[in-house]
Amino acid sequence: YDFTNCDFEKIKAAYLSTISKDLITYMSGTKSTEFNNTVSCSNRPHCLTEIQSLTFNPTAGCASLAKEMFAMKTKAALAIWCPGYSETQINATQAMKKRRKRKVTTNKCLEQVSQLQGLWRRFNRPLLKQQ
């Protein structure tokens, strides 16, 4: 999906209003310095591409974040403010349902969510030059 036509200001407002708080809740008990940010993004469409990938694609050591509250809200925000996004996700959702696993918060998942927090922060500051 090409995130170029999303309403970035609305997605930012959704993040600041509620998604950010859910990410903090998920990470509660973890020191902010515990993980290094290794994933970066260069502009808002790129940030949303990375956020979608890290939130919804299973990775080694972290089978699925998709059922977490922050993930459900992220999916909803993209569906609302990215035209045509929902339609592209129908097949992906059906595939995900087939391989759904029980929710387990592993250290790898915590690291992944820490990366997500960094991507969201970058998304909210699009005019900053890349380090």
């Epitope: 959704a14 209003s17 459900m72 909803a76 609302i80 929902s86």
Partner: nanobody, 132 residues
Framework: EVQLLESGGGLVQPGGSLRLSCAAS????????ITWFRQAPGKEREGVAY????????YYADSVKGRFTISSDNSKNTVYLQMNSLRAEDTAVYYC?????????????????????????WGQGTLVTVSS
């Protein structure tokens, strides 16, 4: 030019009723979500009730569930808030606000409808005072 115009506020005794109206113009009413917000003195603006003019889906704040009813008349481009069993704590300025994408995505909007930062258009507000 987009306009939202609230009316129907006033002074009412505890236990009484009022019906607020929000008349809209200047946008495609049937695609939009309209939400009633309220703001009491010294408090943050809070979402009270949401309606999608696209499919009629409604959401309510817990504090008003069972007492307030939101409805829409698409032929008149007007949304109503029927407020029954009013309490002193319902005293506030009531605003209606409109958002263009949450109307056609009402199920996904369950997470976001009550956040004022997401709305494009606002009325000027109408004061509701509940007092004996």
């Amino acid at each position: 030019e987009v306009q939202l115009l609230e009316s129907g506020g006033g002074l009412v005794q505890p236990g009484g009723s009022l019906r607020l109206s929000c008349a809209a113009s200047g946008f495609t009413f049937g695609d939009y979500a309209i939400t009633w917000f309220r703001q009491a003195p010294g408090k943050e603006r809070e979402g009270v009730a949401y309606i999608s003019n696209f499919d009629g889906m409604t959401y309510y704040a817990d504090s008003v569930k069972g007492r307030f009813t939101i409805s829409s008349d698409n032929s008149k481009n007007t949304v109503y808030l029927q407020m029954n069993s009013l309490r002193a704590e319902d005293t506030a300025v009531y605003y209606c606000a409109a958002e263009g994408r949450m109307g056609t995505h009402s199920r996904d909007s369950v997470y976001f409808w009550a956040f004022s930062a997401l709305y494009d258009y606002w009325g000027q507000g109408t004061l509701v005072t509940v007092s004996s």
